[in-house]
């Protein structure tokens, strides 16, 4: 799992009446925020399922793994984790399932070691373009983030404020070119209808990309060419109908790639011929023997690898004079 984990060694729970320290004051070495559990040995703080409405101000400076899951945070303001002295060791931050709907510019500033961030299962209606870059400069200081987990961050459909959700997320990923070092990006279960064409080209260090359980219909305008380090591409449970020659060639050209394509509604007509030929030859598709046709009806559940060119026909389009009403 990509979420921060910790050993179970000696967690201390703070007394509920412990007064919170002002964030400008250095916390006591053994201090643990109210409603949290702390293990200095594991460098871990867990404030889980406590209905917190803000990030505790008095986090211990030793924290390396911080769990703030299952809370009611709603908003992450600028500098939400800025402390004096800074949380210089914080490397893994899990904020999943904390009812966040707004992440403001600079929310993760002053976390120089933050490598792993999980914002999954939050209804992010308002993700600032500068949430991860921290500034609106055309080129920002590089973010230390290596792993960004954004699964199921789509808000309910009537609460997306008439903006492109895909566009909002991509703007945050690309702002200031801050995420050039990102190696893992998970965007599963977000109802994505399309992938903006420039997003992958600007994340050249990606090793793992998870786009599973979205509503992607086509990859025609998406280029994988620059992703020479890509090791896994998860496209399961989308609405893909066919992969065209350009995409197939780009995927085949990636030296370390494994592609996952299960549970897509493949359309097995004449446009599928190139993909079937490629599937028979390629080693990059994991579980390729499980891929089956969804359409047309006569082809439903046929295994793609077992098809030949004679199976893949397109109904002729009749000229207008021959069409019946």
């Amino acid at each position: 799992s990509s979420s921060p984990t910790s050993s179970a060694s000696s967690f201390s729970s703070s007394a509920p009446f412990l007064a919170s320290a002002v964030s400008a004051q250095p916390p006591l070495p053994d201090q643990c925020p109210a409603l949290c559990e702390c293990s200095e040995a594991a460098r871990t703080v867990k404030c889980v399922n406590r209905n917190l409405t803000e990030v505790p101000t008095d986090l211990p400076a030793y924290v390396r793994n911080l769990f703030l899951t299952g809370n009611q945070l709603a908003v992450l303001p600028a500098g939400a984790f800025a402390r004096r002295p800074p949380l210089a060791e914080l490397a893994a931050l899990n904020l999943s399932g904390s009812r966040l709907d707004e992440v403001r510019a600079g929310a993760f500033e002053h976390l120089p070691s933050l490598r792993q961030l999980d914002l999954s299962h939050n209804p992010l209606a308002d993700l600032s373009p500068f949430a991860f870059s921290g500034s609106n400069a055309s080129v920002s200081a590089p973010s230390p983030l290596v792993e960004l987990i954004l699964n199921h961050i789509v808000p309910p459909e009537d609460e997306r404020q008439n903006r492109s959700f895909e566009g909002m997320v991509v703007a945050a990923l690309l702002a200031g070119r801050a995420l050039q070092g990102l190696r893992r990006l998970e965007l599963a279960s977000n109802h994505f209808l399309y992938l903006p064409r420039d997003v992958l080209a600007q994340l050249p260090s990606l090793r793992h990309l998870d786009l599973s359980n979205n509503s992607l219909v086509s990859l025609t305008y998406v280029s994988f060419r620059n992703l020479t380090h890509l090791e896994s591409l998860h496209l399961e449970d989308n609405a893909l109908k066919v992969l065209h020659n350009g995409t197939l060639a780009e995927l085949q050209g990636l030296p370390h790639i494994r592609v996952f394509l299960d549970n897509n509604p493949w359309v097995c007509d004449c446009h599928m011929a190139d993909m079937v030929t490629w599937l028979k030859e390629t080693e990059v598709v994991q579980g390729k023997d499980r891929l089956t046709c969804a359409y047309p009806e006569k082809m439903r559940n046929r295994v793609l690898l077992e098809l030949n060119s004679a199976d893949l026909d397109c109904d002729p389009i009749l000229p207008p004079s021959l069409q019946t009403s």
Epitope: T53, E54, Q72, L73, A74, V75, R99, D101, E102, P123, A125, D126, P155, P156, E159, Q161
Partner: nanobody
Framework: QVQLQESGGGLMQAGDSLRLSCVVS????????MAWFRQAPGKEREFVAA????????YYADFVKGRFTISRDYAKKTMYLQMNNLKPEDAAVYYC????????????WGQGTLVTVKP
């Protein structure tokens, strides 16, 4: 110009139910909090409940949990406070507020609506 207008207060008996409304206009933020506060005579204003406008996350003061329910109608730009099993100590002027903080929004305030509860 942000404006807030409360309504729905009145003279009630202990055990009754009442619904307060607050109409908001002029807000330009994408995301914001709306909240209810109350102030009884001779006491400080205290937080009652809050709701996030975009995704209706809610939060309550401990003393109203289980009796009061905050909600909002996105289309009507109206927030509500459903108050059940009213107690004499619930008597106060109830104010709605809007702001960017969570949960104690305090950027703009309404004029208040009076709730009186007879024993």
């Amino acid at each position: 110009q942000v404006q807030l207008q409360e309504s729905g207060g009145g003279l009630m008996q202990a055990g009754d139910s009442l619904r307060l409304s607050c109409v908001v206009s002029g807000v330009t933020w994408n995301s914001y909090t709306m909240a209810w506060f109350r102030q009884a005579p001779g006491k400080e204003r205290e937080f009652v409940a809050a709701i996030r406008w975009t995704v209706d996350t809610t939060y309550y003061a401990d003393f109203v949990k289980g009796r009061f329910t905050i909600s909002r109608d996105y289309a009507k730009k109206t927030m509500y406070l459903q108050m059940n099993n009213l107690k004499p100590e619930d008597a106060a002027v109830y104010y709605c507020a809007v702001g960017r903080k969570w949960p104690k929004a305090d950027d703009y305030w309404g004029q208040g609506t009076l709730v009186t509860v007879k024993p």
